[in-house]
């Protein structure tokens, strides 16, 4: 007999608003395999069960986060495979302040990523870049996390802000700095970047 799950990963990241199908199938040497998903919240996707297979459709809602388990059996032999589903939100919605930097001033620059999920400092990281390198000497102030105002009911999204105190930008000043925000998920790294021009 063979037991297969497609995609085969034990952790799957799904962008909010996108759908994903996880197909669990099993074939038996004799007879028809029994395959089903368990550990499902009522809200976690929909299941279509066919002879020898079961398809879990995840709708890409934040409530779809969970760890369903596919169980397949041939007679007295059974196999199982769990899939940790993480639904994330990371739109390219970075806002920087100020809109431009003035050389020779002691200033604070902020970078806000809007409509984020999960709002976990371990998943989301901010960097202030000069070219492709972190800006040497910038001092990171404490990050802020606030709930976004939602038009509809549902699991809330967050905005996360990082501020830095800038070192002297030198002479001549660089044309721009960049705020880079990275979301690190299982087997997936996403990055957005926003320019902060420097007045010349």
């Amino acid at each position: 007999q063979s037991f297969q799950v497609n995609p085969p990963e034990s952790e799957v990241a799904v962008a909010m608003g996108t759908s994903l199908q996880i197909t669990c199938s099993m074939s038996c040497d004799e007879g028809v395999a029994r395959v089903h998903w368990r550990g499902l919240d009522t809200s976690l996707g929909s299941v279509q069960t066919l002879p020898g297979s079961s398809i879990l459709s995840v709708r890409g809602m934040l409530s779809d986060t969970g760890t369903p388990v596919c169980v397949g059996s041939c007679g007295s032999r059974s196999f199982q495979h769990s899939v940790k589903i993480l639904v994330y939100a990371f739109p390219d919605q970075l806002v920087v302040s100020p809109e431009f930097l003035v050389p020779g001033q002691d200033q604070v620059v902020s970078c806000t990523a809007h409509n984020i999920w999960p709002a976990d400092p371990n998943s989301l990281s901010f960097a202030l870049l000069l070219g492709e390198q972190r800006l040497e000497g910038a001092q990171a102030l404490e990050p802020e996390q606030e709930e976004e105002i939602q038009e509809a009911e549902g699991t809330p999204l967050f905005r996360m802000t990082q501020r830095w105190r800038l070192p002297s930008l030198g002479t001549p000043a660089p044309p721009a700095l960049h705020c880079q925000v990275t979301m690190q998920l299982p087997k997936l790294v996403l990055t957005h970047r926003k320019e902060i021009p420097v007045l010349q």
């Epitope: 972190r134 040497e136 000497g137 001092q139 990171a140 102030l141 404490e142 002297s168």
Partner: antibody
């Protein structure tokens, strides 16, 4: 000469309040971010709060958040720390310190003022 | 928060000795590290900033080195006035944090 001088320490009962002051002289006070750092008897240094030159940014260590408030009066060249709901573990010498623009280390410290919280 | 760990926590040395104190950060602080000296009943005094820059007025027998997570304060020839407690501090990100201190005592 650049100087910082703290005052306002003393003995206070648990749950009580105290306001510390730090008088600055010898530099343009409003140009500098300022800090409070404390040191419990026989212990190391613990940063507790900062305030930016224009008071637009403040922050606190978790150990004092919600109980202490930092403020400044640039016209008087004075930094303040309002301490409420004091606990025995707040007993310490409290120092104010200036931080260096563009570099951010604490380059000038006051002599400290002692706060004792005891019944 | 970034943890700063100093070693040793105390040491005994004689006048003229070369003394080395190390400081390790739990994550990279680049070169955003300062060293302070504190004598009993006194305020801390800045010795070194940006990991290796000597503060104005501090004797040249004090030097700092390192970057990232590992830093060293060296006193090339210990003088009687150097017996004190030394603290490292990272100011890369808030909350700024100090090492637990290294007490340098007379042997």
């Amino acid at each position: 000469e650049v100087q910082l001088l703290e005052s306002g320490g003393g003995l206070v009962q648990p749950g009580g309040s105290l306001r510390l002051s730090c008088a600055a002289s010898g530099f343009t006070f409003s140009d500098f971010w300022m800090h409070w750092v404390r040191q419990a008897p026989g212990k190391g240094l613990e940063w507790i709060s900062y305030i930016s030159g224009d008071s637009g940014y403040t922050n606190y260590a978790d150990s004092v958040k919600g109980r202490f408030t930092i403020s400044r009066d640039n016209s008087k060249n004075t930094l303040y720390l309002q301490m409420n709901s004091l606990r025995a573990e707040d007993t310490a010498v409290y120092y104010c310190a200036r931080d260096r623009p563009y570099y951010y280390y604490m380059d000038v410290w006051g002599k400290g003022t002692t706060v004792t919280v005891s019944s | 928060d970034i943890q700063m760990t100093q070693s040793p926590s105390s040491l005994s040395a004689s006048v003229g000795d070369r003394v080395t104190i190390t400081c390790r950060a739990s994550q990279s602080v680049s070169r955003s590290l300062a060293w302070y000296q504190q004598k009993p009943g006194k305020a801390p005094k800045l010795l070194i900033y940006a990991a290796s820059s000597l503060q104005s007025g501090v004797p040249s027998r004090f030097s700092g080195s390192g970057s990232g997570t590992d830093f060293t304060l060296t006193i090339s020839s210990l003088q009687p006035e150097d017996f004190a407690t030394y603290y490292c501090q990272q100011y890369k990100s808030y909350p700024v944090t100090f090492g637990q201190g290294t007490k340098v005592e007379i042997k």
